[in-house]
């Protein structure tokens, strides 16, 4: 068994968790996750690794001269679901009631508030971790009297005698005799979406309260990945 550093066979490759150092022309040890190359190998000495310093990390076996910086702190519309450690970047997820409007390689660049359907409109398609709520007008015989990202259109109550007919934003009002109903009273809620990983957010435009297209803010480029530092 050859110990690092060693010269590979002509046309050969270095072993797992080793890399070929062009300067030394030798196979040298990579540094494990949580560490980086402090001193590169020579023909006679192997790579010297050092621990990643505060708020920096490496997730893979590598020979980077400096660890990667953890992303900035989670913004107010996010929660930190994974702390920055030597071996992993910070992960922020959108808070309940928000979705990832602009994805990036891992997680999300921009969280946006879920659209709220205004009275007369109900949720046609609930929000997911990566898509906004879709609203639809309440069909005849149904209504929604709330501004909500979860309420669907509900059937009007059925009256023996109607005092005030219902419309898209208001339930029917019956005279004093007990109404019958096809559904139990009270708002019907759709479950909140599970958030996705996200980071580096920017302020979000106010949510639209009617069906339509959300707009996104422009954002800068994502930080460089750890490159070809895998096993």
């Amino acid at each position: 068994v050859a110990f690092t550093p060693y010269a590979p066979e002509p046309g050969g490759t270095c072993r797992l968790r080793e890399y070929y150092d062009q300067t030394a022309q030798m196979c040298c040890s990579k540094c494990p996750p949580g560490q980086h190359a402090k001193v590169f190998c020579t023909k006679t000495s192997d790579t010297v690794c050092d621990s990643c310093e505060d708020s920096t990390y490496t997730q893979l076996w590598n020979w980077v001269p400096e660890c990667l910086s953890c992303g900035s702190r989670c913004s107010s519309d996010q929660v930190e679901t994974q702390a920055c450690t030597r071996e992993q970047n910070r992960i922020c997820t959108c808070r309940p009631g928000w979705y990832c409007a602009l994805s990036k390689q891992e997680g999300c660049r921009l969280c946006a508030q879920l659209r709220k359907c205004r009275p007369g409109f109900g949720v046609a398609r609930p929000g997911t971790e990566t898509s906004d709520v879709v609203c639809k007008p309440c069909a005849p015989g149904t209504f929604s009297n709330t501004t909500s990202s979860t309420d669907i259109c509900r059937p009007h109550q059925i009256c023996h005698v109607v005092a005030i007919p219902g419309n898209a934003s208001m339930d029917a009002v019956c005279t004093s005799t007990s109404p019958t109903r096809s559904m139990a009273p009270g708002a019907v809620h759709l479950p909140q979406p599970v958030s996705t990983r996200s980071q580096h957010t920017q302020p979000t435009p106010a949510p639209s309260t009617a069906p339509g297209t959300s707009f996104l803010l422009p954002v800068g480029p994502s930080p460089p990945a750890e490159g070809s530092t895998g096993d």
Partner: antibody, heavy 118, light 106 residues
Framework: EFQLQQSGPELVKPGASVKISCKAS????????MNWVKQSNGKSLEWIGI????????SYNQKFKGKATLTVDQSSSTAYMQLNSLTSEDSAVYYC???????????WGTGTTVTVSS | QIVLTQSPALMSASPGEKVTMTCSAS?????MYWYQQKPRSSPKPWIY???NLASGVPARFSGSGSGTSYSLTISSMEAEDAATYYC?????????FGSGTKLEIK
């Protein structure tokens, strides 16, 4: 409860070596990095080095290179530090401490007093 | 390596008094960490990431600062707070500790 139990006090002669231990309880040993810290005479603290049990790699404070050697025995969830060529300057309390993969020492061992005297 | 200078080295405070101790770094650091140590005991983590209190630390403690200047404050001194407090950084290898501030009760 998560604890680090260190070996008892040592009285050693100048020029000798000593190996002190730090046994971890109630956690997955390989998930935590083990640091060693020196405290001389009730004074301040000096970081000696770190061992990453998951990878078996070490990183040392330049000041303690050649003086301290860090090892682990995963089967017994124990970390060791050997101190070589002891002098009176090495008389101190030595602590093991985990860092949870972050940059501060969240759990400390009980401490081992090493006295170097002829 | 980064040198951390703590001041004062020794201070005393009466119960109920506000206490502030400082830690100055020779180069800028990302975060500061603080430990409490009492005689014949191991250091205990006290404040992490500059301002977060470790588990079990009373709310009268707080930490603040940035760059090269950091501080630990006790809003109202209590007898059990008498101890030595050490600051620590790991923004640069090797991690280093301050020389400590010994806080006594009057």
């Amino acid at each position: 409860e998560f604890q680090l139990q260190q070996s008892g006090p040592e009285l050693v002669k100048p020029g000798a070596s000593v190996k002190i231990s730090c046994k971890a309880s109630s956690y997955s040993f390989t998930d935590y990095n083990m640091n060693w810290v020196k405290q001389s005479n009730g004074k301040s603290l000096e970081w000696i080095g770190i061992i990453f049990p998951k990878y078996g790699t070490t990183s040392y404070n330049q000041k303690f290179k050649g003086k301290a050697t860090l090892t682990v025995d995963q089967s017994s969830s124990t970390a060791y530090m050997q101190l070589n060529s002891l002098t009176s300057e090495d008389s101190a309390v030595y602590y093991c401490a985990t860092d949870g993969g972050t940059w501060y020492f969240d759990v400390w061992g009980t401490g081992t007093t090493v006295t170097v005297s002829s | 390596q980064i040198v951390l200078t703590q001041s004062p080295a020794l201070m005393s405070a009466s119960p109920g008094e506000k206490v502030t101790m400082t830690c100055s770094a020779s180069s800028s650091v990302t975060y500061m960490y603080w430990y409490q140590q009492k005689p014949r005991s191991s250091p205990k983590p006290w404040i992490y990431l500059t301002s977060n209190l470790a588990s079990g630390v009373p709310a009268r403690f707080s930490g603040s600062g940035s760059g090269t200047s950091y501080s630990l404050t006790i809003s109202s001194m209590e007898a059990e707070d008498a101890a030595t407090y050490y600051c620590q950084q790991w923004s640069s290898n090797p991690p280093t500790f301050g020389s400590g501030t010994k806080l006594e009760i009057k």
